[in-house]
């Protein structure tokens, strides 16, 4: 039978009638209303947009559209009393100040409420001192510091370029080696790309532009005080002091004219090598310290941003399923900005709103889905995803029995070459057969389809033929729903041709600068990428939500988890010795995968027999299918970090934006011959392999045939 | 008793690629239970493992060399080779060619090794 014919609608409501109700003039205007004012997280503004979007989603056709409001911790500059950093002589003044705010955009002068560059969390301080310069503050940069430069950044303040690492990564990278402060700036040689010229002029970052930002580690805890649970009206929170994620040393953001200002004074040691200079002109010293004539000046931040716990407001809509109204697709993407939201996240949220829409026109001529679609637009993504973390937690129960697929739905944008996909493997072959539908917008592939530039754009390095899908990280709202619950995930954006920056941002990201203009003067004026992503987008909703059988296919998951078993084995495999000391083996593992590749085989075979029309069979194969993703999850965690519950992926431990496989394995095997006590460390190792081999065993058996 | 043997050139030129073969005698190479593997030991350093091969031709490699390394298995000669490409005077070192048991670093034979130098 097909969709249509499952919920007893007419052949006309198909994919086709939702994509082609989808209009690129439509998601250009509602980006432009998004983004008139500031939508920060916790403001007035955010609340009134919030109240609009539901009162148009329900105009739109929704069932129902809710507010869901929560009481969490937020972080503001102090309005009286900016941050600034300066260099202070040996009398103690200021000689240099950094500048309070970014020069607005052309137009925007007089807009109020826009709030100056700060690190969201910092705490408040005012420490003095040396400066070092510690490249992107990744965890292979302090082994350079370190171990090879043996430069010592205890008491020290270090600068540390933008880029390559989640923000927050680098602030407990510098806490970990002593630092007393840190100040993160936006280098030209990651933030400005060659032969474009800067804001209002092209989409390069001006010299006075600055990437806002919070740096907590929370780990997926959601609301730093109210972790594993929701905060609501009745929630006990714990006291600052044991609060999940704050950093312990100021941090502040600058641009790179005030980031030149300090480096060019810069001594001590020069740089290690040429991957640690970036483009300005400016030796790139490490330090510590000014050199010769300045040797005596010193670095003071000047921090006030206070903690508070403020009201949030997510906005939840939902379209009711015909046939399986308890299982649960949920398109969400977030609605505060930092400033303006031009790309982050309005380009999203005007992608919903298009989507929204669509499905709204659809059911008004009668159709429903066959499940229920719920849709959301998340607040305080920027503070920690905790919007939708909240809500997560609070409706957890319902989710992990219900809940099929989450699809988010960030910036739609962050450059306009081809398509970029992260997503679960069951969902490959659902983008793959979608892809192939759809028309690419890509200059130079009129009449092709989309899966044909981005296979060409953006291929495979492991299957030709193929595109590129990366696997899922964090950094954005799909956290708690991947990584703590289980529930199948994806995101889909057009990017850059840029891979070497994957995780740097494009250059005006959580600046002032990033306006409607940006989007509809440089990035996309025909808006028709933003189409693209929302066909994109919305194609895997529709199917998720109306396909007979659910469009996962579990053979992939097979073939990723054997990748992912080589290339860890690899790595346990360059300490040979000490694999053989502690008769270490990955036996169990590999054992592991062969049997979930034999059971996924099987599993796939009944899949393509089994009578469709027999509800209960049908629902019971589906089910097998939906809580696959979820039989991969370990209700303990992962070590030190409970909310990351995923056995096969979790953000990096070194980087929150980029995912990692086998985790646990991983961050066991990192640095392992450094470690005091060798015989514990590889325990830890034989342990995770344990685990990760039972895990991949426990989920085949829930693809075998139930009795 | 099963024997392996390493057998290439002692001198490579930089930038050029380094091949070695290892012929297995004693025993067939066509088992699922053993992997056959390089590793190598630079002067004055510890071991280093390169890399291995199933029978069917199946690979692992060092993460640190997978660009540079190509390992590949001939079971009707019952030998497995190495290539290692764009080499420095850093690939210097004694190259040996073990079995060992699959999943596992359990290297319970190997050849008596050979000195390749990397020079000019």
């Known amino acids: 039978k097909s969709s249509n014919e499952a919920t007893n609608i007419t052949p006309k409501h198909n994919m086709k009638a939702f994509l082609d109700e989808l209009k690129a003039e439509n998601i250009k205007k509602f980006l432009y209303n998004f983004t008139q004012i500031p939508h920060l997280a916790g403001t007035e503004q955010n609340f009134q947009l919030a109240k609009q979007i539901q009162s148009q989603w329900k105009e739109f056709g929704l069932d129902s559209v809710e507010l869901a409001h929560y009481d969490v911790l937020l972080s503001y500059p102090n309005k009286t009393h900016p941050n600034y950093i300066s260099i202070i002589n040996e009398d103690g003044n200021e000689i240099f100040n950094t500048s309070l705010f970014e020069p607005p955009p052309p137009g925007y002068e007089n807009v109020s409420d826009i709030v100056p560059p700060f690190s969201a969390f910092s705490p408040q301080g005012m420490p003095e001192g040396d400066l070092v310069y510690v490249n992107y503050a990744r965890t292979e940069d302090f082994f350079k510091l370190e171990r090879d430069m043996k430069i010592n950044c205890s008491g020290k303040i270090v600068i540390a370029r933008y880029g390559k690492v989640f923000r927050g990564n680098k602030v407990k990278n510098a806490q970990l080696a002593g630092a007393k402060g840190v100040i993160l700036y936006s280098d030209p040689a990651d933030y400005f790309a060659p032969g474009v010229k800067s804001y209002p002029d092209g989409w390069n970052l001006p010299g006075g532009g600055v990437q806002r930002g919070n740096i907590l580690n929370l780990n997926g805890a959601g609301d730093p005080l109210t972790p594993g649970y929701p905060a609501n009206e009745y929630a006990y929170r714990r006291g600052i002091a044991e609060a999940v994620g704050l950093p312990s040393i100021p941090v502040h953001p600058i641009g790179y004219y005030d980031a030149q200002k300090l480096l060019e004074k810069m001594g001590g040691s020069a740089p290690p090598d040429s991957s640690w200079r970036g483009s300005l002109k400016v030796p790139y010293n490490v330090g510590p310290g000014f050199t010769g004539n300045f040797s005596t000046q010193k670095v003071k931040m000047h921090i006030h941003s206070t903690n508070e716990v403020t009201r949030i407001y997510n906005v939840i809509g939902t379209l009711r399923g015909a046939v399986e109204p308890d299982r649960y697709v949920i398109l969400g993407g977030h609605r505060d900005s930092w400033v303006f939201g031009g790309i982050d996240p309005q380009s999203g949220a005007a992608v919903v709103h298009e989507i929204v829409r669509s499905f709204g026109t659809l059911k008004k001529e009668g159709w429903r889905p066959r499940r229920t679609i719920l849709f959301a637009s998340w607040d305080a993504e920027e503070f920690g995803l905790l919007g939708s973390t909240e809500w997560a937690e609070e409706n957890s129960r319902l989710l992990q029995e219900r809940g099929v697929a989450y699809i988010n739905a960030d910036s739609s944008i962050e450059g306009n070459y081809t398509l970029r996909v992260d997503c679960t493997p069951l969902m490959y072959s659902l983008v793959h057969n979608l892809t192939k539908e759809l028309k690419s917008p890509d200059e130079g592939f009129e009449g092709k389809s989309l899966y044909e530039s981005w296979t060409k754009k953006s291929p495979s390095p492991e299957f030709s033929g193929m595109p590129r899908i990366s696997k899922l990280g964090s950094g954005n709202d799909f956290e708690v729903f991947f990584q703590r619950l289980g529930i199948a995930s994806g995101r889909a954006r057009y990017t850059k041709n840029w891979e070497t920056n994957k995780f740097s941002g494009y250059p005006l990201y959580h600046s002032v600068y990033e306006t409607y203009e940006l989007v509809e003067k440089f990035y996309d004026p025909m808006f028709k990428y933003h189409l693209t992503v929302a066909q994109v987008r919305g194609g895997m909703v529709f199917e998720l939500a109306n396909s007979i059988v659910l469009p996962f296919d579990c053979r992939d998951y097979a073939v990723v988890l054997r990748k992912y078993a080589d290339k860890i084995y690899s790595i346990s495999m360059k300490h040979p010795q000490e694999m053989k000391t502690y008769s270490v083996s990955f036996d169990s593992l590999f054992s592991a995968v062969k049997n979930f590749t034999e059971i996924a085989s099987k599993f796939s075979e009944r899949l393509q027999d089994f009578d469709k029309s027999n509800p209960i069979v049908l629902r019971m194969m589906n089910d097998q299918l939906m809580f696959l993703e979820r039989a991969f999850i370990d209700p303990l965690g992962l070590p030190d970090r409970p909310f990351y519950r995923h056995v096969i992926y979790a953000p990096s431990s070194h980087n929150k934006y980029a995912g990692e496989s086998f985790p646990g394995i991983y961050d066991a095997l990192f640095d392992i011959e450094s470690k005091v006590d060798p015989s514990k460390a590889w325990g830890e190792v034989k342990r995770q392999i344990y685990v990760a081999a039972f895990t991949v065993q426990a989920a085949a058996e829930t693809l075998s045939e139930v009795a | 008793q099963l024997q392996l043997q390493e057998s290439g050139p002692g001198l490579v030129k930089p930038s050029e690629t380094l091949s070695l073969t290892c012929t297995v005698s004693?025993?067939?190479?066509?088992?699922?239970?053993y992997y056959w593997g390089w590793i190598r030991q630079p002067p004055g350093k510890g071991l280093e493992w390169i890399g291995s091969v199933d029978y069917s031709g199946y690979t692992y490699y060092n993460p640190s060399l997978q660009s540079r390394v190509t390992i590949s298995v001939d079971t009707s000669k019952n030998q497995f080779s190495l290539k290692l490409s764009s080499v420095t005077a850093a690939d210097t070192a004694v190259y040996n060619c073990?079995?060992?048991?699959?999943?596992?670093?359990?290297?319970?034979?190997r050849g008596q090794g050979t000195l390749v130098t990397v020079s000019s």
């Open positions: 004693g025993g067939s190479i066509s088992s699922s239970s």
């Open positions: 073990a079995r060992h048991k699959a999943a596992t670093a359990d290297f319970d034979y």
